[in-house]
Protein backbone atom coordinates (compact mmCIF):
# COMPACT_ATOMS: atom_id res chain seq x y z
CA UNK A 1 0.00 0.00 0.00
CA UNK A 2 1.82 3.12 -1.13
CA UNK A 3 1.06 6.71 -0.14
CA UNK A 4 0.51 8.55 -3.42
CA UNK A 5 1.79 11.91 -2.17
CA UNK A 6 4.12 13.04 0.59
CA UNK A 7 1.79 15.91 1.50
CA UNK A 8 -1.57 15.34 3.15
CA UNK A 9 -4.60 16.15 1.01
CA UNK A 10 -6.20 17.80 4.04
CA UNK A 11 -5.62 18.35 7.74
CA UNK A 12 -7.87 19.42 10.55
CA UNK A 13 -8.13 19.50 14.32
CA UNK A 14 -10.75 17.41 16.07
CA UNK A 15 -11.40 15.90 19.44
CA UNK A 16 -11.62 12.14 19.51
CA UNK A 17 -14.20 10.26 21.55
CA UNK A 18 -15.48 6.71 21.73
CA UNK A 19 -18.86 5.61 20.48
CA UNK A 20 -20.00 5.79 24.14
CA UNK A 21 -18.85 9.42 24.33
CA UNK A 22 -15.77 8.88 26.45
CA UNK A 23 -12.91 11.20 25.58
CA UNK A 24 -9.48 10.16 24.36
CA UNK A 25 -6.97 12.17 26.38
CA UNK A 26 -3.20 12.42 26.34
CA UNK A 27 -1.02 13.04 29.40
CA UNK A 28 2.72 13.63 29.65
CA UNK A 29 4.14 11.30 32.30
CA UNK A 30 7.87 10.75 32.89
CA UNK A 31 8.80 12.29 29.53
CA UNK A 32 6.47 10.01 27.59
CA UNK A 33 2.81 10.34 26.71
CA UNK A 34 0.10 8.10 28.06
CA UNK A 35 -3.26 7.69 26.29
CA UNK A 36 -6.43 7.44 28.35
CA UNK A 37 -10.09 6.77 27.63
CA UNK A 38 -12.15 8.57 30.24
CA UNK A 39 -15.29 10.48 31.09
CA UNK A 40 -14.63 14.18 31.24
CA UNK A 41 -16.23 16.51 33.76
CA UNK A 42 -18.84 18.85 32.32
CA UNK A 43 -16.63 21.85 31.49
CA UNK A 44 -13.34 20.00 31.08
CA UNK A 45 -11.62 20.76 27.79
CA UNK A 46 -11.30 17.95 25.27
CA UNK A 47 -7.85 17.20 23.92
CA UNK A 48 -7.44 17.90 20.24
CA UNK A 49 -5.81 15.74 17.60
CA UNK A 50 -4.44 16.89 14.26
CA UNK A 51 -5.74 14.48 11.63
CA UNK A 52 -3.75 14.43 8.41
CA UNK A 53 -5.38 12.64 5.46
CA UNK A 54 -3.28 10.99 2.79
CA UNK A 55 -4.33 9.15 -0.35
CA UNK A 56 -2.90 5.70 -0.88
CA UNK A 57 -3.14 3.14 -3.61
CA UNK A 58 -4.06 -0.42 -2.70
CA UNK A 59 -1.46 -2.89 -4.01
CA UNK A 60 -4.09 -5.10 -5.64
CA UNK A 61 -5.35 -2.23 -7.80
CA UNK A 62 -6.82 -4.01 -10.80
CA UNK A 63 -7.64 -1.08 -12.99
CA UNK A 64 -4.23 0.37 -13.71
CA UNK A 65 -5.53 3.92 -14.11
CA UNK A 66 -5.97 4.39 -10.39
CA UNK A 67 -9.76 4.63 -10.34
CA UNK A 68 -9.92 1.60 -8.09
CA UNK A 69 -8.09 0.88 -4.87
CA UNK A 70 -7.76 4.41 -3.53
CA UNK A 71 -7.89 4.58 0.25
CA UNK A 72 -7.70 7.35 2.80
CA UNK A 73 -4.90 6.96 5.30
CA UNK A 74 -4.72 9.15 8.40
CA UNK A 75 -2.07 10.07 10.90
CA UNK A 76 -3.10 11.34 14.32
CA UNK A 77 -0.99 13.85 16.22
CA UNK A 78 -2.18 15.16 19.61
CA UNK A 79 0.88 17.35 20.09
CA UNK A 80 3.75 18.63 17.98
CA UNK A 81 6.11 15.94 16.67
CA UNK A 82 4.19 13.10 18.38
CA UNK A 83 2.00 10.64 16.47
CA UNK A 84 -0.09 7.62 17.35
CA UNK A 85 1.74 4.45 16.35
CA UNK A 86 0.52 0.89 16.06
CA UNK A 87 2.68 -1.53 18.03
CA UNK A 88 1.54 -4.72 16.37
CA UNK A 89 3.72 -7.00 18.52
CA UNK A 90 2.25 -5.70 21.77
CA UNK A 91 -1.23 -5.06 20.29
CA UNK A 92 -0.94 -1.56 21.70
CA UNK A 93 -1.38 2.00 20.52
CA UNK A 94 1.45 4.29 21.56
CA UNK A 95 2.50 7.92 21.16
CA UNK A 96 5.98 8.29 19.72
CA UNK A 97 8.08 11.22 18.68
CA UNK A 98 8.83 10.88 14.98
CA UNK A 99 10.28 12.84 12.13
CA UNK A 100 8.83 12.94 8.65
CA UNK A 101 8.61 10.81 6.62
CA UNK A 102 6.62 8.98 9.25
CA UNK A 103 6.96 5.21 9.61
CA UNK A 104 4.19 2.96 8.31
CA UNK A 105 3.15 2.27 11.92
CA UNK A 106 1.84 5.85 12.14
CA UNK A 107 -0.63 5.39 9.27
CA UNK A 108 -4.17 4.06 9.62
CA UNK A 109 -6.72 3.28 6.91
CA UNK A 110 -9.84 5.34 7.52
CA UNK A 111 -13.18 3.52 7.56
CA UNK A 112 -16.49 5.37 7.86
CA UNK A 113 -18.73 3.02 9.73
CA UNK A 114 -21.59 5.45 10.18
CA UNK A 115 -21.99 8.91 8.75
CA UNK A 116 -20.39 10.53 11.79
CA UNK A 117 -18.13 7.81 13.13
CA UNK A 118 -14.91 6.28 11.94
CA UNK A 119 -12.56 3.39 12.54
CA UNK A 120 -8.80 3.27 12.12
CA UNK A 121 -7.22 0.15 10.59
CA UNK A 122 -3.52 -0.41 11.03
CA UNK A 123 -1.63 0.03 7.77
CA UNK A 124 0.98 -2.48 8.88
CA UNK A 125 -1.49 -5.13 10.04
CA UNK A 126 -4.68 -5.24 7.94
CA UNK A 127 -7.74 -6.38 9.87
CA UNK A 128 -6.41 -4.86 13.08
CA UNK A 129 -8.09 -1.67 14.33
CA UNK A 130 -7.57 0.91 17.04
CA UNK A 131 -10.05 0.03 19.75
CA UNK A 132 -10.87 0.48 23.42
CA UNK A 133 -9.79 -2.11 25.96
CA UNK A 134 -9.78 -1.57 29.73
CA UNK A 135 -9.97 2.22 29.43
CA UNK A 136 -6.97 2.31 27.11
CA UNK A 137 -6.48 2.27 23.37
CA UNK A 138 -5.36 -1.06 22.00
CA UNK A 139 -5.11 -2.87 18.70
CA UNK A 140 -8.06 -5.17 18.18
CA UNK A 141 -8.28 -7.88 15.54
CA UNK A 142 -11.57 -7.82 13.65
CA UNK A 143 -12.40 -10.93 11.66
CA UNK A 144 -13.68 -10.12 8.18
CA UNK A 145 -16.72 -12.26 8.95
CA UNK A 146 -17.61 -9.95 11.86
CA UNK A 147 -19.49 -6.72 11.38
CA UNK A 148 -16.97 -3.88 11.54
CA UNK A 149 -19.58 -1.81 13.36
CA UNK A 150 -18.56 -3.35 16.68
CA UNK A 151 -18.70 -0.41 19.07
CA UNK A 152 -15.26 -0.72 20.65
CA UNK A 153 -13.54 0.24 17.38
CA UNK A 154 -15.88 3.14 16.58
CA UNK A 155 -14.78 6.70 17.24
CA UNK A 156 -16.45 10.07 16.82
CA UNK A 157 -14.61 13.09 15.51
CA UNK A 158 -16.01 16.34 16.83
CA UNK A 159 -15.11 19.64 15.31
CA UNK A 160 -13.05 22.13 17.20
CA UNK A 161 -13.14 25.88 16.77
CA UNK A 162 -9.51 26.34 17.79
CA UNK A 163 -6.96 26.47 15.02
CA UNK A 164 -3.77 26.02 17.03
CA UNK A 165 -1.94 22.72 17.44
CA UNK A 166 -0.22 22.75 20.81
Amino acid sequence: MSITGISPITEYLASLSTYNDQSITFALEDESYEIYVEDLKKDEKKDKVLLSYYESQHPSNESGDGVDGKMLMVTLSPTKDFWLHANNKEHSVELHKSEKPLPDQAFFVLHNMHSNSVSFESKTDPGVFIGVKDNHLALIKVDSSENLSTENILFKLSETHHHHHH
Epitope: T10, Y12, H114, S115, N147, S149, E159, H161
Partner: antibody, heavy 121, light 106 residues
Protein backbone atom coordinates in the same frame (compact mmCIF):
# COMPACT_ATOMS: atom_id res chain seq x y z
CA UNK B 1 -13.35 1.74 -16.93
CA UNK B 2 -15.88 2.52 -14.19
CA UNK B 3 -19.49 2.17 -15.31
CA UNK B 4 -22.73 2.68 -13.41
CA UNK B 5 -25.96 1.87 -15.24
CA UNK B 6 -29.29 2.75 -13.65
CA UNK B 7 -32.54 1.09 -14.71
CA UNK B 8 -36.11 0.85 -13.42
CA UNK B 9 -37.36 4.39 -13.88
CA UNK B 10 -40.65 5.23 -15.54
CA UNK B 11 -44.10 6.70 -15.08
CA UNK B 12 -45.88 5.63 -11.90
CA UNK B 13 -49.03 6.75 -10.11
CA UNK B 14 -48.89 8.41 -6.67
CA UNK B 15 -48.90 5.85 -3.87
CA UNK B 16 -47.41 3.11 -6.03
CA UNK B 17 -43.93 1.54 -5.88
CA UNK B 18 -40.89 1.35 -8.11
CA UNK B 19 -37.53 -0.35 -7.72
CA UNK B 20 -34.40 1.19 -9.23
CA UNK B 21 -31.27 -0.84 -9.94
CA UNK B 22 -27.72 0.27 -10.57
CA UNK B 23 -25.27 -2.24 -12.01
CA UNK B 24 -21.61 -1.39 -11.45
CA UNK B 25 -18.50 -2.53 -13.27
CA UNK B 26 -14.83 -1.60 -13.55
CA UNK B 27 -14.06 -1.48 -9.82
CA UNK B 28 -14.14 -3.61 -6.68
CA UNK B 29 -17.77 -2.92 -5.83
CA UNK B 30 -17.79 -4.47 -2.34
CA UNK B 31 -15.17 -2.01 -1.07
CA UNK B 32 -17.12 1.16 -1.80
CA UNK B 33 -19.99 3.08 -0.30
CA UNK B 34 -22.75 3.63 -2.86
CA UNK B 35 -25.31 6.42 -3.14
CA UNK B 36 -28.52 7.57 -4.75
CA UNK B 37 -28.85 11.26 -5.62
CA UNK B 38 -31.83 12.82 -7.38
CA UNK B 39 -32.57 15.93 -9.40
CA UNK B 40 -36.08 17.22 -9.97
CA UNK B 41 -36.62 18.76 -13.43
CA UNK B 42 -34.85 22.12 -13.63
CA UNK B 43 -33.77 21.91 -9.99
CA UNK B 44 -30.60 21.22 -8.01
CA UNK B 45 -29.06 17.99 -6.75
CA UNK B 46 -30.43 16.30 -3.64
CA UNK B 47 -28.74 13.43 -1.81
CA UNK B 48 -31.28 10.67 -1.18
CA UNK B 49 -29.59 7.65 0.37
CA UNK B 50 -26.24 6.02 1.20
CA UNK B 51 -25.14 2.48 1.95
CA UNK B 52 -21.77 1.42 3.30
CA UNK B 53 -19.61 -1.19 1.59
CA UNK B 54 -20.93 -4.23 3.45
CA UNK B 55 -24.54 -3.04 3.42
CA UNK B 56 -24.75 -2.92 7.21
CA UNK B 57 -25.38 0.80 7.49
CA UNK B 58 -27.92 2.80 5.50
CA UNK B 59 -28.89 6.48 5.56
CA UNK B 60 -31.81 8.43 4.13
CA UNK B 61 -32.99 11.92 3.40
CA UNK B 62 -35.67 12.76 6.00
CA UNK B 63 -38.44 13.13 3.42
CA UNK B 64 -37.93 9.56 2.09
CA UNK B 65 -37.36 7.79 5.43
CA UNK B 66 -39.81 4.93 5.88
CA UNK B 67 -40.73 4.97 2.18
CA UNK B 68 -37.41 4.26 0.42
CA UNK B 69 -35.02 1.40 1.09
CA UNK B 70 -31.46 1.17 -0.22
CA UNK B 71 -29.82 -2.24 -0.47
CA UNK B 72 -26.96 -3.92 -2.31
CA UNK B 73 -25.92 -7.29 -3.63
CA UNK B 74 -22.13 -7.40 -3.63
CA UNK B 75 -22.07 -10.72 -5.47
CA UNK B 76 -23.94 -9.11 -8.37
CA UNK B 77 -22.31 -5.65 -8.17
CA UNK B 78 -25.74 -4.04 -7.86
CA UNK B 79 -27.26 -1.38 -5.63
CA UNK B 80 -31.03 -0.94 -5.38
CA UNK B 81 -33.49 1.74 -4.34
CA UNK B 82 -36.93 0.42 -3.46
CA UNK B 83 -39.36 3.35 -3.54
CA UNK B 84 -42.77 2.90 -1.95
CA UNK B 85 -45.69 5.30 -1.41
CA UNK B 86 -44.40 7.52 -4.17
CA UNK B 87 -45.40 11.19 -4.23
CA UNK B 88 -45.40 13.76 -7.00
CA UNK B 89 -42.46 15.51 -5.31
CA UNK B 90 -40.37 12.34 -5.85
CA UNK B 91 -40.41 13.06 -9.60
CA UNK B 92 -36.75 13.38 -10.58
CA UNK B 93 -33.83 11.86 -12.40
CA UNK B 94 -32.22 9.40 -9.99
CA UNK B 95 -28.45 8.99 -10.17
CA UNK B 96 -26.38 6.21 -8.72
CA UNK B 97 -22.86 7.18 -7.59
CA UNK B 98 -19.81 5.50 -6.07
CA UNK B 99 -17.51 6.80 -3.38
CA UNK B 100 -13.98 7.93 -4.14
CA UNK B 101 -12.21 5.73 -1.58
CA UNK B 102 -12.38 2.20 -0.23
CA UNK B 103 -14.47 2.09 2.95
CA UNK B 104 -15.10 5.85 3.15
CA UNK B 105 -18.25 7.93 2.73
CA UNK B 106 -16.42 10.80 1.04
CA UNK B 107 -16.98 12.24 -2.45
CA UNK B 108 -19.00 10.93 -5.40
CA UNK B 109 -16.20 10.03 -7.78
CA UNK B 110 -18.35 8.48 -10.53
CA UNK B 111 -21.99 8.89 -11.49
CA UNK B 112 -24.33 6.95 -13.72
CA UNK B 113 -26.34 8.71 -16.44
CA UNK B 114 -29.50 8.59 -14.34
CA UNK B 115 -32.98 7.14 -14.71
CA UNK B 116 -36.10 9.33 -14.80
CA UNK B 117 -38.91 8.65 -12.33
CA UNK B 118 -42.19 10.47 -13.02
CA UNK B 119 -44.91 10.28 -10.37
CA UNK B 120 -48.19 11.42 -11.85
CA UNK B 121 -51.80 10.33 -12.10
CA UNK C 1 -28.53 19.27 9.67
CA UNK C 2 -25.97 21.28 7.75
CA UNK C 3 -27.25 23.76 5.17
CA UNK C 4 -25.13 24.84 2.21
CA UNK C 5 -25.72 28.24 0.59
CA UNK C 6 -24.16 29.11 -2.76
CA UNK C 7 -23.77 32.57 -4.28
CA UNK C 8 -24.43 33.98 -6.72
CA UNK C 9 -27.28 31.92 -8.18
CA UNK C 10 -26.29 32.99 -11.70
CA UNK C 11 -22.93 34.32 -12.80
CA UNK C 12 -22.35 35.86 -16.21
CA UNK C 13 -18.75 36.47 -17.30
CA UNK C 14 -16.61 36.81 -20.41
CA UNK C 15 -14.24 34.21 -21.84
CA UNK C 16 -10.87 34.62 -20.12
CA UNK C 17 -12.33 36.16 -16.96
CA UNK C 18 -11.39 34.96 -13.49
CA UNK C 19 -14.55 33.66 -11.90
CA UNK C 20 -15.20 33.03 -8.20
CA UNK C 21 -18.09 30.97 -6.82
CA UNK C 22 -18.92 30.97 -3.12
CA UNK C 23 -20.32 28.32 -0.81
CA UNK C 24 -21.20 28.86 2.85
CA UNK C 25 -21.95 26.09 5.36
CA UNK C 26 -24.21 26.56 8.39
CA UNK C 27 -21.54 24.87 10.58
CA UNK C 28 -17.83 24.15 10.39
CA UNK C 29 -17.38 21.30 7.89
CA UNK C 30 -13.64 20.78 8.38
CA UNK C 31 -12.79 21.07 4.68
CA UNK C 32 -15.04 18.08 3.90
CA UNK C 33 -16.29 19.78 0.75
CA UNK C 34 -16.45 18.91 -2.96
CA UNK C 35 -17.36 20.85 -6.09
CA UNK C 36 -19.33 19.23 -8.92
CA UNK C 37 -19.90 20.48 -12.45
CA UNK C 38 -23.08 19.64 -14.34
CA UNK C 39 -23.56 20.51 -17.97
CA UNK C 40 -27.05 20.54 -19.51
CA UNK C 41 -28.29 17.01 -20.17
CA UNK C 42 -25.30 15.36 -18.46
CA UNK C 43 -24.60 13.70 -15.14
CA UNK C 44 -22.62 15.73 -12.59
CA UNK C 45 -18.83 15.37 -12.53
CA UNK C 46 -16.47 15.68 -9.56
CA UNK C 47 -14.08 18.62 -9.98
CA UNK C 48 -12.55 19.25 -6.55
CA UNK C 49 -12.51 17.08 -3.44
CA UNK C 50 -11.56 17.88 0.16
CA UNK C 51 -11.79 21.62 -0.59
CA UNK C 52 -8.69 22.04 -2.76
CA UNK C 53 -7.72 18.76 -4.45
CA UNK C 54 -8.19 18.55 -8.21
CA UNK C 55 -9.83 15.38 -9.47
CA UNK C 56 -7.80 13.52 -12.10
CA UNK C 57 -8.43 14.84 -15.62
CA UNK C 58 -9.84 18.21 -14.54
CA UNK C 59 -8.10 21.27 -16.07
CA UNK C 60 -5.79 23.19 -13.72
CA UNK C 61 -7.75 26.43 -14.25
CA UNK C 62 -10.14 25.06 -11.61
CA UNK C 63 -9.09 25.47 -7.99
CA UNK C 64 -10.74 25.35 -4.60
CA UNK C 65 -10.03 26.97 -1.26
CA UNK C 66 -11.61 27.63 2.11
CA UNK C 67 -11.95 26.34 5.66
CA UNK C 68 -14.46 26.35 8.49
CA UNK C 69 -17.73 27.51 6.94
CA UNK C 70 -16.55 29.46 3.87
CA UNK C 71 -15.43 27.88 0.61
CA UNK C 72 -14.62 29.08 -2.89
CA UNK C 73 -14.32 27.59 -6.37
CA UNK C 74 -12.21 29.65 -8.75
CA UNK C 75 -11.95 29.34 -12.53
CA UNK C 76 -8.79 31.28 -13.39
CA UNK C 77 -9.67 31.83 -17.05
CA UNK C 78 -13.24 31.04 -18.04
CA UNK C 79 -13.61 28.90 -21.18
CA UNK C 80 -16.74 28.31 -23.31
CA UNK C 81 -16.79 24.65 -22.20
CA UNK C 82 -17.08 25.77 -18.54
CA UNK C 83 -20.71 26.84 -19.08
CA UNK C 84 -22.50 24.66 -16.54
CA UNK C 85 -24.08 24.62 -13.09
CA UNK C 86 -21.65 24.15 -10.19
CA UNK C 87 -22.68 22.53 -6.92
CA UNK C 88 -20.82 22.46 -3.62
CA UNK C 89 -21.34 19.43 -1.43
CA UNK C 90 -20.46 18.71 2.20
CA UNK C 91 -19.83 15.29 3.77
CA UNK C 92 -18.58 16.26 7.21
CA UNK C 93 -21.91 15.44 8.82
CA UNK C 94 -24.40 13.64 6.63
CA UNK C 95 -24.48 14.71 2.98
CA UNK C 96 -25.76 18.05 1.64
CA UNK C 97 -25.57 19.88 -1.68
CA UNK C 98 -25.72 23.61 -2.20
CA UNK C 99 -28.46 24.88 -4.52
CA UNK C 100 -26.01 25.53 -7.39
CA UNK C 101 -24.47 28.44 -9.30
CA UNK C 102 -25.19 28.67 -13.01
CA UNK C 103 -22.20 30.01 -14.99
CA UNK C 104 -22.93 31.67 -18.32
CA UNK C 105 -20.81 33.38 -20.97
CA UNK C 106 -21.61 37.08 -21.59
Amino acid sequence: EVQLVETGGGLVQPGRSLKLSCVASGFTFSNYWMYWIRQAPGMGLEWVSSINNDGGNTYYLDSVKGRFTISRNNAENTVYLQMNSLRSEDTATYYCAKGRYYYSSYSFAYWGQGTLVTVSS
Amino acid sequence: DIQMTQSPSVLSASVGDRVTLSCKASHNINKHLDWYQQKVGEAPKLLIYFTNNLQTGIPSRFSGSGSGTDYTLTISSLQPEDVATYFCFQYNSGWTFGQGTKVEIK
